[in-house]
Amino acid sequence: TKTESSSRGPYHPSECCFTYTTYKIPRQRIMDYYETNSQCSKPGIVFITKRGHSVCTNPSDKWVQDYIKDMKEN
């Protein structure tokens, strides 16, 4: 699911998640991540894949939390 631009102001990154991916992204395909802005209507973690795709995920999902721990540790 591509992220969509938010029109709420000059935030960086200026994107919000409106839907979440319906599948897990293999860990080895992920290069980076960021949290969407707190003013977005839904919380979101955006994973950036090695191919440059942005994928919106639900921060409450166990696998998302575990991926983030991995990336913080490495």
Epitope: T22, P26, R27, Q28, D61, K62, W63, D66
Partner: antibody, heavy 122, light 109 residues
Framework: CQSLEESGGDLVKPGASLTLTCTAS?????????MCWVRQAPGKGLEWIAC????????TYYATWAKGRFTISKTSSTTVTLQLTSLTAADTATYFC??????????????WGQGTLVTVSS | AQVLTQTPSPVSAAVGGTVTINCQSS????????LAWYQQKLGQPPKLVIY???KLASGVPSRFKGSGSGTHFTLTISELQCDDSATYYC???????WGFGGGTEVVVK
Amino acid sequence: CQSLEESGGDLVKPGASLTLTCTASRFDFSSAYYMCWVRQAPGKGLEWIACIYAGSSGGTYYATWAKGRFTISKTSSTTVTLQLTSLTAADTATYFCAGSTGNSRGSYFNLWGQGTLVTVSS
Amino acid sequence: AQVLTQTPSPVSAAVGGTVTINCQSSQSVYDNNWLAWYQQKLGQPPKLVIYDASKLASGVPSRFKGSGSGTHFTLTISELQCDDSATYYCQGEYSDIWGFGGGTEVVVK
């Protein structure tokens, strides 16, 4: 074909400790999400024990009743262990290793070992 | 603690018939649909049949159908075959735990 094999099951006395090992064949945990242990007492149903995230951070999740007495660990890229302590007769069961390798957001156990039998008796 | 209750057990039906198994969770599974069904035959490990409440696992015939959301779920097996005789378990995933139902034995006569 991916497979899991459990080992370490034994006949032990009450109060004893035991370590069970789950070994993955033809895949490593980089292609898995969660590795788990499930047990089944003779003639009874399935009981979830614990899961460990297969990535480097190795986050662990336990059934309430298993916390403090059972410990799940990832000991290599292809092995997971379950340490059992203070065993009682109620822990007598077949212990299954189960893996979640599917891409669904939910983590379901699509890969199972054949199980290893733990018998606790004096 | 989350409790998954399965009914009825056991259940029997004739070859070619239909059986329905219910699974009720004491609280909503995560995302309302993180529920699976497993088939277990005597002396064998369980086999994933349905995941995400209604999706068919790989290699499972379309005679198996899962439905439901939140706390109430159903597994329906139609056009029963002798090979469907087994114990079926529901399994829910919650925010940080998993759990199994008590199992329902299906006997195909």
